[in-house]
């Protein structure tokens, strides 16, 4: 029988390489049964997860999974950092694994570098 | 259950490229991470780099510099690793591997393939 | 990088003993989601290594009750508690906390 409590499928050190001024969906995918879970990104700030308030939140469904989506639009050079998706579920909180944002500014670059680049080499990026 | 099938030429000659396959059954890849680890003969294990087959993306350990490359193609459920410039001292067994991204539930070895690196 | 340090290198011992193998990391192994992402990996002759344990303690599935893991921060032990003559090996300890992974250098267990 498969379980019925929640699970948030952001993998374990995953991070995404994106360009200031591009927008950008960060996407929490979430697996229920009956109920759909309230969800809420929060950003790292150290060890505290700061949640995001007023900002452009979607979802989305697809056949076996619901995806909580937190919109860049666009994508700021603050946006750099850990996020982290969180469901209240049950009067329990489930937190996904933190993932994480390294922007590029193109301002501030001479050449916009490959996916490929920036993918094998993120320290090249923000701290 | 997870299997992973290693395939690739076992010998290089010096300054040449090794290249191996590594392909996957009983998981789709995009759900996971996918490493590659080698031995030389009589030594321990090196990490050498992995793959999120879900985006492309991948992180490498500084001691191969800019020699290796891992790439994946979810279409055909695998990952390939490239060394360049390789010496002697590259000769040893390559072992791909894949885990569970999300709750580290499984963590599976392929057989592992000897490269030589001779002339 | 994080430096794996096992001891003992080798180690004799007979079916029915207990065996204990440390495992000390360079620096913490914590995450910052507060698991230590510490494994054990055997190894025997000519074969792939086989994942015995994760998160420091939990078994794989079809691992004998006989293995445990236990330790926190840089410190880590692999316990046997009564060798079968199937566990005679090379042991590999492992983080999967920050990059790059690093290995232990291994702990080879022989029949006495």
């Known amino acids: 029988k498969e379980s019925c409590d929640v699970q948030l499928y952001i993998k374990r050190q995953s991070y995404h390489s994106i360009f200031a001024g591009d927008p950008f969906k960060l996407e929490c995918p979430v697996k229920y049964c009956a109920h759909r879970p309230q969800v809420t990104w929060c950003k790292l700030n150290g060890t505290t997860c700061v949640k995001l308030e007023g900002r452009h939140t979607s979802w989305k469904q697809e056949k076996n999974l619901s995806f909580f989506i937190l919109h860049f639009e666009p994508v700021l050079p603050s946006d750099n950092g850990s996020y982290r998706c969180s469901a209240n579920f049950l009067s329990a909180i489930i937190e996904s694994h933190s993932t994480t944002l390294y922007v590029t500014d193109v301002k501030s670059a001479s050449e916009r570098p490959s996916k490929d680049e920036m993918a094998s080499r993120p320290w090249l990026l923000y701290s | 259950q997870v299997q992973l099938q290693e395939s690739g030429p076992g010998l290089v000659k010096p300054s040449g490229t090794l290249s191996l396959t590594c392909a996957a059954s009983?998981?789709?890849?995009?759900?996971?991470?996918m490493y590659w680890v080698r031995q030389p003969p009589g030594k321990g294990l090196e990490w050498i780099g992995r793959?999120?087959?879900?985006?492309?993306?991948?992180r490498y350990n500084p001691s191969f510099k800019s020699r290796a490359t891992i790439s994946a193609d979810k279409s055909k459920n695998q990952a390939s690793l490239k060394l360049s410039s390789v010496t002697a001292a590259d000769t040893a067994v390559y072992y791909c591997?894949?885990?569970?991204?999300?709750?580290?539930?499984?963590?599976?070895w392929g057989q592992g393939t000897l490269v030589t690196v001779s002339s | 990088d994080i430096q794996m340090t096992q001891s003992p290198s080798s180690l004799s011992a007979s079916v029915g003993d207990r065996v204990t193998i440390t495992c000390r990391s360079s620096?913490?192994?914590?995450?910052?989601?507060?698991?230590?992402?510490l494994n054990w990996l055997q190894q025997k002759p000519g074969k792939a290594p086989k994942r015995l344990i994760y998160?420091?303690?939990k078994l794989d599935s079809g691992v004998p009750s006989r293995f445990s893991g236990s330790g926190s921060g840089t410190d880590f032990t692999l316990t046997i508690s009564s060798l079968q003559p199937e566990d005679f090996a090379t042991y590999y300890c492992?983080?999967?906390?920050?990059?790059?992974?690093?290995f232990g250098q291994g702990t080879k267990l022989e029949i006495k």
């Open positions: 591997a894949v885990y569970d991204g999300y709750y580290e539930s499984f963590d599976v």
């Open positions: 009983g998981v789709n890849i995009k759900d996971t991470y």
């Open positions: 793959i999120d087959p879900a985006n492309g993306y991948t």
């Open positions: 620096q913490s192994l914590l995450d910052s989601d507060g698991k230590s992402y």
């Open positions: 998160l420091v303690s």
């Open positions: 492992w983080q999967g906390t920050l990059f790059p992974r690093t």
